[in-house]
Amino acid sequence: GSERACCPVNWVEHERSCYWFSRSGKAWADADNYCRLEDAHLVVVTSWEEQKFVQHHIGPVNTWMGLHDQNGPWKWVDGTDYETGFKNWRPEQPDDWYGHGLGGGEDCAHFTDDGRWNDDVCQRPYRWVCETELDKASQEPPLL
């Protein structure tokens, strides 16, 4: 395939990535699947500049990102290293809280209304952000 030259319609470009901001809510797994079907992934926040960009676009609304610990350690969906990477948790978070009464803890990360991160029950219907890299080879065949 060829490299994408620009972002798809209704996606926003920033620093060689394309972003799509939902206006409805889905559970984390459904949001993750939605992005994959778009040949993208839930947003992976790798820097303070990217954090500010996403925060500006989503506003003060709970929004899923591509970070979870459903299999133990925290992992970014694209394989970016969590331990050495950018983090912006709220104080005392993540806390894997069990007190919500919904069963289990909290295994999925989201932007809170102030932009900092929290872990929450993955079934909550939050908005989400998809991201894809412009430098990634697209699935479309090259033009002859």
Partner: antibody
């Protein structure tokens, strides 16, 4: 033009607290995070944390967690940094600095805090 | 935490000299690096942001380059007002960290 004007020098005893102010002008105060950076005499620069004046969110360097509080008063476009349980090694010049693109683009003139018994 | 190192720690130079200062991050920070100039008793002044972008009002003799872990600040022709201490700073992730500084003084 953008200006950050800080409060005057302070002398404090060990164990006391200090509150430094930083008044912003020349831009929309709630539109930019404000950072605090300190510099001990003859030493380098040390980031302490930030406050988002728009929603009062904060992020503190782990070294200062539990001892520092950053606040703001949007009505007078002023950010504050309070440091508690002062020690002699907290003697430093404390600067506020506006968040820019991967940088601190404007700085306050600095406030010297001297901790001495 | 990301550690920042600078070299040299000091350099003696003359007016008109080309001066190069290097900064290295302990892990990749892409292009999220800034350079500052500080004179005694004054606040730091932003020179370069995003590794190579010149801050408004800063003379064009200052330039920055690099990406990932290795970065450079170059002063193409040193002027009398450039004698100062220069710091790099990573703004990729918290805690933001600074290099130890490079003092440029008169030879």
């Amino acid at each position: 033009q953008v200006q950050l004007v800080q409060s005057g020098a302070e002398v404090k005893k060990p164990g006391a607290s200090v509150k430094v102010s930083c008044q912003a002008s020349g831009y929309t105060f709630t539109g930019y995070h404000m950072h605090w950076v300190r510099q001990a005499p003859g030493q380098g620069l040390e980031w302490m944390g930030w406050i988002n004046p728009n929603n009062n969110a904060t992020n503190y360097a782990q070294k200062f967690q539990g001892r520092v509080t950053m606040t703001r008063d949007t009505s007078i476009s002023t950010a504050y940094m309070e440091l508690r349980r002062l020690r002699s090694d907290d003697t430093a010049v404390y600067h506020c600095a506006r968040d820019g693109t991967s940088s601190f683009d404007y700085w306050g003139q600095g406030t010297l805090v001297t901790v001495s018994s | 935490d990301i550690q920042m190192t600078q070299s040299p720690s000091s350099v003696s130079a003359s007016v008109g000299d080309r001066v190069t200062i290097t900064c290295r991050a302990s892990q990749g920070i892409r292009k999220w690096l800034a350079w500052y100039q500080q004179k005694p008793g004054k606040a730091p002044k932003l020179l370069i942001y995003a590794a190579s972008s010149l801050q408004s009002g800063v003379p064009s003799r200052f330039s920055g380059s690099g990406s990932g872990t290795d970065f450079t600040l170059t002063i193409s022709s040193l002027q009398p007002e450039d004698f100062a201490t220069y710091y790099c700073q990573q703004a990729n992730s918290f805690p933001f960290t600074f290099g130890p500084g490079t003092k440029v003084d008169i030879k």
